[in-house]
C-alpha cells in the first residue's frame, strides 16, 4: 500500500522542515520540577515500542508506522544501559533499584546495593538504598505507585522495599530462617517502610491472613489471603491515616478518587497481577489509564507536588509467554495512560519520563507490506516451504516441533490473541534481552536526558530536577506555578 | 562476576553525578557546521550496538557493558523510524534515500521518491531526489564516500544515484529493455551524476569491461570486469580531473592520501564487497578506519568544508548470514573508524551523525553472567535439555534440525567465527527488522537530533546545519574557524 501523498517529495520535505522547526524551538527549562512521573513499560524494548506504534495506528485505521505514540511526542530521548552488576541481561528487581534508587544491584534483589546477595537475608542490613519516591516523600511531596502487576512486584517494590529476594511477596514466601533473621516480606514493607499516599494495582492476597476469602473470588481458596503471620496489612495501613481508603473494584476507585476526604488511597483490584487489558472486566477492574487518572487526582492536591510511578507491568508477561498480542495491547494501554497523564498535568511543572527496565528477545522482521497486520505473515515462504510470522522470539514457549518439523502457520492463527510466536529455542518462559532501552523525557530538566547513560542516571535526573537528596542544592529556579 | 567497587552505592552515585554535571554543561552550538560526516552502520540496530559494546569492552579485558563505544560518547540521541513508503521493514535502498536525500522511497529503489516503482525503468525520470552530498558539492564543499561494501551498493548509492533497482550495479545487471529506456547502472552514475572527490570501498568489477582481469585476482575470471558496454569507468573518471588518482591496494592508498597533488581519489580494494575485517589481508586491503582517515586527509584541505559518508556496510551481511561474530566485529571496526574521525576533526565545526539504516532480527538474552562471552551459552538448559546461546535470531540460515530436533551447542562451537546462531524460522538470509534505530549526534546543531523522528529528518538536519538547500537561509552564525 503506497499512500499517494507520500509519493510526493514535498510531503517528506514539509514534514521534516516542520520537525526541524520544532527542534529549533526546543528551549531547556531552567526551572525545577514540582512533580515527577516515571512511566515504566516493563520489558518495553525498542522493538516493542515500534510494533505497538504500528498496532495503535492500525487500530485507528492508519497504515501504522507513520503514527505517533504518546511517548513518541516526548522531546528528549536517551538510551539506557540496563545490565545489573552481576548479569549482562537483568531482571526487573535489579533494574528497579537502578532507575528508582540510582544504584545498580544484583539480579533479583530490590532496593539494595550489589553488596547484597540474592536470597541471603543476612546481606540486607546496611546495604539498603533509598528511592527517589522516598526522598520525595521526605521533601513533603505526595507519592504514588500504580501498576498492572501486583503492587508487591519487582518494579513497584523498587520504590519502597529492600529485599534480597524479589519473590518474597508475603511472609508465606519468605523462608523461616530469613524471617527469623528479620527479613520482611515486600507486602509488609509496602505499608511500613514509608508513607505512600496512593497504591493502585493487584496483589490483594499478600495483604491478608491465610484463610481470608477474596472479595471478588470468595469461593476460590487459591485466591484468598496467604499471610502466615495472621496480619491484615490493609487494616494496619488504614489505621495509620485518618483519610485512608481501601478499594478493590473500579466503582469504588472512581468514587474515592473524587472524594475530597480521601487523603490516602489503596486500591487492590486482583488477588495477584491484574488481568491483561484484553481480559479485563471493565465493570470490576479499572484500566491502567483509569488508575493513573485516579492517582493524579489525589496526588495533585499537594501544593508541594508529587512523585508518581506508573507501570505497564504486564507487557513483560505477554512477552514471557511469547504472546505478542498480549504484550502489544498492554503497551498500547500503557501509552494511553501516558497520554491521559499528559492531559492532566503541565509540562511547565511536571517532569515525565517514560522508559523500560529491560527489553525482550522479540523481533519484527520479514519485509511485510506497509499496512499489513503486525500479527500477520511475512511475504513468501521459509526454506521449509512454510509460512512464518513477522513477529518472532529468540527463545520462549512458542518453539514447537510437529512431526519433527516447524509447524506451518496461517494468518488467522497468527492473529489470534492466544497465538504464541515461534522461537529458536524452547523455554518455559521467553527471556529478557540485554540491549539498551529508550528513555523519553518531557518537562523541567528533561533536556538532561541525553546520549547513552547508565540506567541509574534516571533516578538522578529525577532527584536533581526536583531538588531532592542528594541534589537539594540544585540551584534551579522554583518551578512555574508553585504554590508552596 | 561482581566488581567490588560496584558494590558500593558511592560508585554509582558519583558516576551519575558526573553524568549529570556533563549533561548540565551541554550547550547547543549556535554556529553552522563547516563539515558533515554521516557514519552509517548498515543493519546496526540497538541490539547490535549493545552487543558490540560488550565485545569491544571484553577485547580490552573489561567485563563489557560498562565500557563506552565511540558512538556512546556522542551527546545527543534520537530514535529514527525506518519504514519505507511501501514496507514496514525496509531495505538499504529506500532507507538511504531517506537519510541521505530527506525523502522516503520504495523498497529497493534508490534516490527516487515513492512515485517510482521497483524495477520499472520508466518511473525514474522526474522522480529523482537530490542527496545532501550533492547539495554540499554544489555549495563548494569537497565530498566523499567510504564503505566496506562495493561503492555501488545501496547505502553509498543513495548519495549519488537514482535507480529503480538497487541491484543494477553495472550495465550487465540492467535488463536490455531498461538500458534502451535510458536507465543507467549505478557504476555509471557514480562517475557521471556528480563530482565526488573521494570514493573508497569495494566494487572494482563493475567499473571495467567484461574480460578485464582483476589486478588482485588476475587468473580468476569471476572476479574480472563485468561491463557489457566496453567502458572503463575508472579511466573515464581519471580523465575528468587533473589531480585524480586510482588505487586498488592499501599501500597505494596510504601513499595517495599523503600526496598533495592528489585532488580526487578513487580506491577500489576488492572486485565486489570488501572482505570482512576478520578476513582482511592487512597488506592488500585497508581497514575502514584507514579508509576514513585517508578520506579525511584529502577532504579537510577544502577551506569550505566537506561532506563525508562512512559506512560499516558489512555489519548487515554478518547478520544476514546469522553469524553474529562477523556482524559484531564489523561493528567494532565501524566504531574504531568513528573514534579515529573524532581525533582528526573538531566538534566545533564538524557535525557528526552515527545511525543505522535499519535493524536485524537479532537478540541478546538468556540472563548470562556479567563478563561472560557475548558469543557464549546462557546459564542452564532449554526445555529440550540442550544448551542455547545468548545471541539468537528470529529467522535466518542458523535454523537447523538434526534428527528432527534442535541441535545442541557447546561454548567452543558458539564462540567460533563461523558459527551461525540458531533462529526460529529457516531462511536463506536472515531479514532486517523494523524497529526504530538510534541516531547519535555531535557538533554544530547536533542538539536538533532529539526525540522520535522520521529517518528523513537526518538529511534535513545535515542540510540545515551546513546551510545547504533548502536551508540556505539558515540564519546560523558562520562556523568557528571558517576560512572561506
Amino acid at each position: 500500500i503506497i499512500p499517494v501523498e507520500e509519493e510526493n517529495p514535498d510531503f517528506w520535505n514539509r514534514q521534516a522542515a516542520e520537525a526541524l522547526g520544532a527542534a529549533k524551538k526546543l528551549q531547556p527549562a531552567q526551572t525545577a520540577a514540582k512533580n515527577l512521573i516515571i512511566f515504566l513499560g516493563d520489558g518495553m524494548g525498542v522493538s516493542t515500542v515500534t510494533a505497538a506504534r504500528i498496532l495503535k495506528g492500525q487500530k485507528k485505521d492508519k497504515l501504522g508506522p507513520e503514527t505517533f505514540l504518546a511517548m513518541d511526542r516526548f522531546p528528549y530521548v536517551a538510551l539506557s544501559k540496563t545490565y545489573s552488576v552481576d548479569k549482562h541481561v537483568p531482571d526487573s528487581g535489579a533494574t528497579a533499584t537502578a532507575y528508582l534508587c540510582g544504584v545498580k544491584g544484583n539480579f533479583q534483589t530490590i532496593g539494595l546495593s550489589a553488596a547484597a546477595r540474592f536470597n541471603q537475608c543476612n546481606t540486607t542490613r546496611g546495604n539498603e538504598v533509598i528511592s527517589v519516591m522516598n526522598r520525595a516523600k521526605k521533601a513533603g511531596k505526595s507519592v504514588g505507585v500504580v501498576t498492572t502487576t501486583r503492587v508487591q512486584h519487582a518494579s513497584p517494590a523498587g520504590a519502597y522495599a529492600h529485599t534480597v529476594n524479589r519473590n518474597w511477596y508475603s511472609d508465606a514466601d519468605v523462608p523461616a530462617s530469613a524471617r527469623q533473621e528479620g527479613c520482611q516480606d515486600i507486602a509488609t514493607q509496602l505499608i511500613s517502610n514509608m508513607d505512600i499516599d496512593v497504591i493502585l494495582g493487584g496483589g490483594r492476597k499478600y495483604m491478608f491472613p491465610m484463610g481470608t476469602p477474596d472479595p471478588e473470588y470468595p469461593d476460590d481458596y487459591s485466591q484468598g489471603g496467604t499471610r502466615l503471620d495472621g496480619k491484615n496489612l490493609v487494616q494496619e495501613w488504614l489505621a495509620k491515616h485518618q483519610g485512608a481508603r481501601y478499594v478493590w473494584n473500579r466503582t469504588e476507585l472512581l468514587q474515592a478518587s473524587l472524594d475530597p476526604s480521601v487523603t490516602h488511597l489503596m486500591g487492590l483490584f486482583e488477588p495477584g497481577d491484574m488481568k491483561y487489558e484484553i481480559h479485563r472486566d471493565s465493570t470490576l477492574d479499572p484500566s491502567l489509564m483509569e488508575m493513573t487518572e485516579a492517582a493524579l487526582l489525589l496526588l495533585s492536591r499537594n501544593p508541594r507536588g508529587f512523585f508518581l510511578f506508573v507501570e505497564g507491568g504486564r507487557i513483560d508477561h505477554g512477552h514471557h509467554e511469547s504472546r505478542a498480542y498480549r504484550a502489544l495491547t498492554e503497551t498500547i494501554m500503557f501509552d494511553d495512560a501516558i497520554e491521559r497523564a499528559g492531559q492532566l498535568t503541565s509540562e511547565e511543572d511536571t517532569l515525565s519520563l517514560v522508559t523500560a527496565d529491560h527489553s525482550h528477545v522479540f523481533s519484527f522482521g520479514g519485509y511485510p507490506l506497509r499496512g499489513s497486520s503486525i500479527f500477520g505473515l511475512a511475504p513468501g515462504k521459509a526454506r521449509d516451504r512454510k509460512a512464518y510470522t513477522v513477529l518472532l522470539y529468540g527463545n520462549g514457549p512458542g518453539y514447537v516441533l510437529k512431526d519433527g518439523a516447524r509447524p506451518d502457520v496461517t494468518e488467522s492463527e497468527s492473529g489470534s490473541p492466544e497465538y504464541r510466536q515461534q522461537s529458536a529455542v524452547p523455554l518455559d518462559g521467553e527471556t529478557h534481552a540485554g540491549e539498551d532501552v529508550a528513555v523519553f523525557a518531557r518537562g523541567p530538566q528533561a533536556h538532561l536526558v541525553h546520549g547513552v547513560q547508565e540506567q541509574t542516571f534516571i533516578a538522578h535526573v529525577m532527584a536533581f530536577a526536583a531538588c531532592l537528596e542528594p541534589y537539594t542544592a540544585c540551584d534551579l529556579a522554583p518551578r512555574a506555578g508553585t504554590t508552596d | 562476576i561482581i566488581p567490588v567497587e560496584e558494590e558500593n552505592p558511592d560508585f554509582w552515585n558519583r558516576q551519575a553525578a558526573e553524568a549529570l554535571g556533563a549533561a548540565k554543561k551541554l550547550q547547543p552550538a549556535q554556529t553552522a557546521a563547516k563539515n558533515l560526516i554521516i557514519f552509517l552502520g548498515d543493519g546496526m540496530g540497538v541490539s547490535t550496538v549493545t552487543a558490540a559494546r560488550i565485545l569491544k569492552g571484553q577485547k580490552k579485558d573489561k567485563l563489557g557493558p560498562e565500557t563506552f563505544l565511540a558512538m556512546d560518547r556522542f551527546p545527543y540521541v534520537a530514535l529514527s523510524k525506518t519504514y519505507s513508503v511501501d514496507k514496514h521493514v525496509p531495505d538499504s535502498g529506500a532507507t538511504a534515500t531517506a537519510y541521505l536525500c530527506g525523502v522516503k522511497g520504495n523498497f529497493q529503489t534508490i534516490g527516487l521518491s515513492a512515485a517510482a516503482r521497483f524495477n520499472q525503468c520508466n518511473t525514474t525520470r522526474g522522480n529523482e531526489v537530490i542527496s545532501v552530498m550533492n547539495r554540499a558539492k554544489k555549495a563548494g564543499k569537497s565530498v566523499g564516500v567510504v564503505t566496506t561494501t562495493r561503492v555501488q551498493h545501496a547505502s553509498p548509492a543513495g548519495a549519488y544515484a537514482h535507480t529503480v533497482n538497487r541491484n543494477w550495479y553495472s550495465d550487465a545487471d540492467v535488463p536490455a529493455s531498461a538500458r534502451q529506456e535510458g536507465c543507467q547502472d549505478i557504476a555509471t552514475q557514480l562517475i557521471s551524476n556528480m563530482d565526488i572527490d573521494v570514493i573508497l570501498g569495494g566494487g572494482r568489477k563493475y567499473m571495467f569491461p567484461m574480460g578485464t582481469p582483476d589486478p588482485e585476482y588476475p587468473d580468476d575470471y569471476s572476479q574480472g570486469g563485468t561491463r557489457l558496454d566496453g567502458k572503463n569507468l575508472v579511466q573515464e573518471w581519471l580523465a575528468k580531473h587533473q589531480g585524480a588518482r586510482y588505487v586498488w591496494n592499501r599501500t597505494e592508498l596510504l601513499q595517495a592520501s599523503l600526496d598533495p597533488s592528489v585532488t580526487h581519489l578513487m580506491g577500489l580494494f576488492e572486485p565486489g564487497d570488501m572482505k570482512y575485517e576478520i578476513h582482511r589481508d592487512s597488506t592488500l586491503d585497508p581497514s575502514l578506519m584507514e579508509m576514513t582517515e585517508a578520506a579525511l586527509l584529502l577532504l579537510s584541505r577544502n577551506p569550505r568544508g566537506f561532506f563525508l559518508f562512512v559506512e560499516g556496510g558489512r555489519i548487515d551481511h554478518g547478520h544476514h548470514e546469522s553469524r553474529a561474530y562477523r556482524a559484531l566485529t564489523e561493528t567494532i571496526m565501524f566504531d574504531d573508524a568513528i573514534e579515529r574521525a573524532g581525533q582528526l576533526t573538531s566538534e566545533e565545526d564538524t557535525l557528526s551523525l552515527v545511525t543505522a539504516d535499519h535493524s536485524h532480527v537479532f537478540s541478546f538474552g538468556g540472563y548470562p553472567l556479567r563478563g561472560s562471552s557475548i558469543f557464549g551459552l546462557a546459564p542452564g538448559k532449554a526445555r529440550d535439555r540442550k544448551a542455547y546461546t545468548v545471541l539468537l535470531y528470529g529467522n535466518g540460515p542458523g535454523y537447523v534440525l538434526k534428527d528432527g530436533a534442535r541441535p545442541d551447542v557447546t561454548e567452543s562451537e558458539s564462540g567460533s567465527p563461523e558459527y551461525r546462531q540458531q533462529s526460529a524460522v529457516p531462511l536463506d538470509g536472515e531479514t532486517h527488522a523494523g524497529e526504530d534505530v538510534a541516531v547519535f549526534a555531535r557538533g554544530p546543531q547536533a542538539h536538533l537530533v532529539h526525540g522520535v523522528q522520521e529517518q528523513t529528518f537526518i538529511a534535513h538536519v545535515m542540510a540545515f546545519a551546513a546551510c545547504l538547500e533548502p536551508y540556505t537561509a539558515c540564519d546560523l552564525a558562520p562556523r568557528a574557524g571558517t576560512t572561506d
Partner: antibody
Framework: EVQLVESGGGLVQPGRSLRLSCTAS????????MSWFRQAPGKGLEWLAL??????????EYSASVKGRFTISRDNSKSILYLQMNSLKTEDTAVYYC??????????????WGQGTLVTVSS | DTQMTQSPSSLSASVGDRVTITCKAS??????IAWFQYKTGKAPKLFIH???TLQPGVPSRFSGSGSGRDYTLTISSLQPEDIATYYC????????FGQGTKLEIK
C-alpha cells in the same frame, strides 16, 4: 606467489610422536586461516585441524578423529604452520597436506595446497 | 558435525559423456560447497567453490549447481584428462569431505 611446503614426514613407530611443518611464503601469513588434511592409502581426503588468523585470536578446531592427540599451531614470525601428532597409530599413515583458506563469497575456500608429506606409522 | 554423502563412489563413462556426481549434506550448507579433483601423488586441486564458481584454468565443461542440502558437479563432455577422483567439500561449518567419486573411462 603463494607457496606451501610441508616437511617432517617419515617413518615412526606406533605410540610415538611426530611434528609436521608447513612453511608458507608469498602472502601475509597472520591474516589467513590454515588447515591440515590427510589422505590415507586407498581412503578419501580428511580434514584434521584448523587454526584461524590474528583477527580471530588464532583459535583452533579439530576433527573428532584427532582431537586430543593432534595439536595445530603456528609460528607467525617464521610463517610456519605445525601439526604436533602424539600417540600415533597405524591408521594415521597418510599423506599430510597443509592448506590456506581464502575468503571468497565469505566462505573459507581452500584455494592453496602444499604437495604433501608422507607419514608412515609402522612397527 | 555436518556429514557429506557423495554418490556414486565410482563411475565409468565414455569420452564425450555427460557425467554427474552428487553430494548431499546432513544439513543446509548455504551453498558453501567446493569440488576438488585429486590425482594420485598430486595435491588436491580446487575446481569449483561456492557451489558454481569455477576456479581459474578449470575448463568450462565443468559446472556446479545446487542449494540447501543437495549439490551436483557436472562434466558436460568427459575428456580423458578428467580421469581422477572428485571430492565435494562443505565449508559452511568447519570442513567435511564427501567419500569421493572415482571416475574411469569405459
Amino acid at each position: 606467489e603463494v607457496q606451501l611446503v610441508e616437511s617432517g614426514g617419515g617413518l615412526v613407530q606406533p605410540g610415538r610422536s611426530l611434528r609436521l611443518s608447513c612453511t608458507a611464503s608469498g602472502f601475509t601469513f597472520t591474516d589467513y586461516y590454515m588447515s591440515w588434511f590427510r589422505q590415507a592409502p586407498g581412503k578419501g581426503l580428511e580434514w584434521l585441524a584448523l587454526i584461524r588468523n590474528k583477527a580471530t585470536g588464532y583459535t583452533t578446531e579439530y576433527s573428532a578423529s584427532v582431537k586430543g592427540r593432534f595439536t595445530i599451531s603456528r609460528d607467525n614470525s617464521k610463517s610456519i604452520l605445525y601439526l604436533q601428532m602424539n600417540s600415533l597409530k597405524t591408521e594415521d599413515t597418510a599423506v599430510y597436506y597443509c592448506a590456506r583458506a581464502s575468503f571468497y563469497y565469505d566462505g573459507k575456500v581452500l584455494a592453496y595446497w602444499g604437495q604433501g608429506t608422507l607419514v608412515t606409522v609402522s612397527s | 558435525d555436518t556429514q557429506m554423502t557423495q554418490s556414486p563412489s565410482s563411475l565409468s563413462a565414455s569420452v564425450g559423456d555427460r557425467v554427474t556426481i552428487t553430494c548431499k549434506a546432513s544439513q543446509d550448507i548455504n551453498k558453501y560447497i567446493a569440488w576438488f579433483q585429486y590425482k594420485t601423488g598430486k595435491a588436491p586441486k580446487l575446481f569449483i567453490h561456492y557451489t558454481s564458481t569455477l576456479q581459474p584454468g578449470v575448463p568450462s565443461r565443468f559446472s556446479g549447481s545446487g542449494s540447501g542440502r543437495d549439490y551436483t558437479l557436472t562434466i558436460s563432455s568427459l575428456q580423458p584428462e578428467d580421469i581422477a577422483t572428485y571430492y565435494c567439500l562443505q565449508y559452511d561449518n568447519l570442513y567435511t569431505f564427501g567419500q569421493g567419486t572415482k571416475l574411469e573411462i569405459k
